[in-house]
C-alpha cells in the first residue's frame, strides 16, 4: 500500500547549470493523496533557509505527480545558490533535499566553466 504522506522528490545533491538572462523553472515534484499541501520555496543562506515570499510560483498538475514551480524570469547572477521546497501537511513540515543553481553570467560566458569543472569545486562537498 502506497504511503499517503506528502513526499517531495527533489533529488539529493542535484544541480542545474543555467545562464543569467535566460528564463528558468525550478520544479519541486510533490506527491500527495487528497488535499494539495501548501508548498513554499526558500533559499539557503548558511544553515538557514530564507523563505522566498515575493517570487512568481505556479502549480503544474500531471497524472501521478504535481510540480510546484519557482519561476526565474529572467535568471539573475545572484540567483546562484541552493534552494529547498517545503510542504505543510497535517501540522508537519516536510522539507526536500536542496538543489543548487550555478548561474553563469552571460558577460563572462566565454570563460564559462564546464558542468564538470563546476562539479570539481570544493564547495560542492555538501557539508
Amino acid at each position: 500500500k502506497e504511503s499517503c504522506d506528502v513526499q517531495l522528490y527533489i533529488k539529493r545533491q542535484s544541480e542545474h547549470s543555467i545562464l543569467a538572462g535566460d528564463p528558468f523553472e525550478l520544479e519541486c515534484p510533490v506527491k500527495y493523496c487528497a488535499n494539495r499541501p501548501h508548498v513554499t520555496w526558500c533559499k539557503l543562506n548558511g544553515t538557514t533557509c530564507v523563505k522566498l515570499e515575493d517570487r512568481q510560483t505556479s502549480w503544474k498538475e500531471e497524472k501521478n505527480i504535481s510540480f510546484f514551480i519557482l519561476h526565474f524570469e529572467p535568471v539573475l547572477p545572484n540567483d546562484n545558490g541552493s534552494y529547498r521546497c517545503s510542504a505543510n501537511f497535517q501540522s508537519n513540515l516536510i522539507e526536500s533535499h536542496s538543489t543548487t543553481l550555478y548561474v553563469t553570467d552571460v558577460k563572462s560566458a566565454s570563460e564559462r566553466p564546464s558542468k564538470d569543472e563546476m562539479a570539481s569545486r570544493p564547495w560542492l562537498l555538501y557539508r
Epitope: E15, L125, Y126
Partner: antibody, heavy 119, light 112 residues
Framework: EVQLQQSGAELVKPGASVKLSCTVS????????IHWVKQRPEQGLEWIGR????????KYDPKFRGKATITADASSNTAALQVSSLTSEDTAVYFC????????????WGHGTTLTVSS | EVVMTQTPLTLSVTIGQSASISCKSS???????????LNWFLQRPGQSPKRLMH???KLDSGVPDRFTGSGSGTDFTLKISGVEAEDLGVYYC?????????FGGGTKLETK
C-alpha cells in the same frame, strides 16, 4: 520489476574508444540518477560518476575525468558510458546503477559489461 | 576524497558462526540533512553487488534479519549472526555523503 540491461562484452584495441549502454525498465530514468561503477579483475569497486538524466548534469570522480563520459537519453530510458584512449588498465567489468528518485543510495544494479582491452 | 578502510581483508568462518566486519571512514559521514550515507553490499562470485543495508542500519527488503548494521560518524560495523552458505562472498562498505563516492576495499567471507 526494475531491470538495468547492459550491453554485451567488448574486446577493443588499445587507443580506441568504446561506448557501453544501460537500458532501464521499471522506472523513468528522469526520476533517478544513473551511476557507473568499475571493477577490475579480482579487484574492488570504484565509482566512476553519475548523470542526472533530467538535465544532463554529470559528476565524476576526478581520476576518471577525461577518461569517461556519461550520457543519457531519457526518451529511450538509456544511459551510456564512453571510455576513451583505452589501455589495459581499462580492462574491467562496468556496472550501471540506478537510484530511486535520486536518493543516491545505489538501489538497482545492472549485471555488468566486461570490457577487455587487448591488441 | 573520503577513504573507506575495511577490516579484516579475509574472514574465515564456520557455517553457523557469527561474523563481524568493520568499516572506518577518514571523515564523518553525517550529512547536513542529518542522515549518514553508509551502505553495505554483498558481491557473490560472478554476480553484481547487491545492497544489504542502507543509511547504516536499514535492512533492504528480502535481506534476512541475521544481518545488522551499526555505527555513526566514522566507525561502522556489519554483523552476521549465524553465517549461512549463501552469505559467502565479498562485502563492501560505501559512502555517499561526499563526492566522489567511495567504496571500502572489500572483505572476503569464506568458510574454514
Amino acid at each position: 520489476e526494475v531491470q538495468l540491461q547492459q550491453s554485451g562484452a567488448e574486446l577493443v584495441k588499445p587507443g580506441a574508444s568504446v561506448k557501453l549502454s544501460c537500458t532501464v525498465s521499471g522506472f523513468n530514468i528522469k526520476d533517478s540518477y544513473i551511476h557507473w561503477v568499475k571493477q577490475r579483475p579480482e579487484q574492488g569497486l570504484e565509482w566512476i560518476g553519475r548523470i542526472d538524466p533530467a538535465n544532463g548534469n554529470t559528476k565524476y570522480d576526478p581520476k576518471f575525468r577525461g577518461k569517461a563520459t556519461i550520457t543519457a537519453d531519457a526518451s529511450s530510458n538509456t544511459a551510456a558510458l564512453q571510455v576513451s584512449s583505452l589501455t589495459s588498465e581499462d580492462t574491467a567489468v562496468y556496472f550501471c546503477v540506478g537510484d530511486h528518485y535520486g536518493s543516491s543510495l545505489f538501489d538497482y544494479w545492472g549485471h555488468g559489461t566486461t570490457l577487455t582491452v587487448s591488441s | 576524497e573520503v577513504v573507506m578502510t575495511q577490516t579484516p581483508l579475509t574472514l574465515s568462518v564456520t557455517i553457523g558462526q557469527s561474523a563481524s566486519i568493520s568499516c572506518k571512514s577518514s571523515q564523518s559521514l553525517l550529512d547536513s540533512d542529518g542522515k549518514t550515507y553508509l551502505n553495505w553490499f554483498l558481491q557473490r562470485p560472478g554476480q553484481s553487488p547487491k545492497r544489504l543495508m542502507h543509511l547504516v542500519s536499514k535492512l533492504d527488503s528480502g535481506v534476512p534479519d541475521r544481518f545488522t548494521g551499526s555505527g555513526s560518524g566514522t566507525d561502522f560495523t556489519l554483523k552476521i549472526s549465524g553465517v549461512e552458505a549463501e552469505d559467502l562472498g565479498v562485502y563492501y562498505c560505501w559512502q555517499g555523503t561526499y563526492f566522489p563516492y567511495t567504496f571500502g576495499g572489500g572483505t572476503k567471507l569464506e568458510t574454514k
